[in-house]
């Protein structure tokens, strides 16, 4: 199966790399604009320069292009705890991230929220906190993992999954009681 090409891709494929086909005259290939610039006017003829202008403040293009407008710079989502790692330039979008000892939780492909890494109190660190993943904790005996926190088995209700994890502890207690009576 041949992948479907959009009109723009079809037009671009006729010209060599770094050039695009003139929208009004398909016999002319114009040079694409460098990153950090956008297309103001198509080249008037073969071998003549494309009129490219630098992106204005608050906008960018990150690769060579023939866009009529630069792209708007992204804004870091403060309500998601995001911080600006590097500000927007004419050729690079804003880079947003999280503070130290935080990880990114992606709600969807382009939306992340910053959360504090778990400290594994009443347990040990199985896997360290990473940029996109919380610490993975292993709990000490007498504790079970609930929402990545080690919770005392005394908080384990029969209906919860923790009964399996806390059962050995309960059996041990029964075992000691039994051995004491003989």
């Amino acid at each position: 199966l041949v992948p479907h090409l959009g009109d723009r891709e079809k037009r671009d494929s006729v010209c060599p790399q770094g050039k695009y086909i003139h929208p009004q005259n398909n016999s002319i290939c114009c040079t694409k604009c460098h990153k950090g610039t956008y297309l103001y006017n198509d080249c008037p003829g073969p071998g003549q320069d494309t009129d490219c202008r630098e992106c204005e403040s608050g906008s960018f293009t990150a690769s060579e292009n023939h866009l009529r407008h630069c792209l708007s710079c992204s804004k870091c989502r403060k309500e998601m705890g995001q911080v600006e790692i590097s500000s927007c330039t004419v050729d690079r979008d804003t880079v947003c991230g999280c503070r130290k000892n935080q990880y990114r939780h992606y709600w969807s492909e382009n939306l992340f929220q910053c959360f504090n890494c778990s400290l594994c109190l009443n347990g040990t660190v199985h896997l360290s906190c990473q940029e996109k993943q919380n610490t993975v904790c292993t709990c000490h005996a007498g504790f079970f993992l609930r929402e990545n926190e080690c919770v005392s088995c005394s908080n384990c209700k029969k209906s919860l999954e923790c009964t399996k994890l806390c059962l050995p502890q309960i059996e041990n207690v029964k075992g000691t009681e039994d051995s004491g009576t003989t």
Epitope: H105, S108, N110, F115, S118, N148
Partner: nanobody, 120 residues
């Protein structure tokens, strides 16, 4: 077919409480983050709260922080929103939403909504 059915809305006095429920079916509930979105009369959609599929991650809009609590019961395929200290500005239709893992749009399915009216 994905189905989300909200319930628990109604008329409540300022300062009162309500608990919204959302029964989900037609998809593997445990695999998806879920959320609540609201639309006040004459206004656009606003994210209220989100909860991750398994971990401790939750999101609350600044306007509801400390008053609303989102939770889920994966064994019952149900999402909840406990709403306390309700204010007149919380009046809206509340929609339960399934959050897409892919694409620029976080919200891919939502229910028909339940109306919450806060008035004395």
């Amino acid at each position: 077919e994905v189905q989300l059915f909200e319930s628990g809305g109604g008329l409540v006095q300022p300062g009162g409480s309500l608990r919204l429920s959302c029964a989900a079916s037609g998809f593997t509930f445990t695999r998806y983050s879920m959320g609540w979105v609201r639309q006040a009369p004459g206004k656009g959609l606003e994210w209220v709260s989100m909860i991750a599929h398994a971990g401790p991650e939750t999101y609350y809009a600044d306007s509801v922080k400390g008053r609303f609590t989102i939770s889920r019961d994966n064994s019952k395929n149900t999402l909840y929103l406990q709403m306390n200290s309700l204010r007149a500005e919380d009046t809206a239709v509340y929609y339960c939403a399934k959050i897409s893992q892919f694409g620029s749009n976080a919200l891919d399915y939502w229910g028909r909504g339940t109306l919450v009216t806060v008035s004395s």
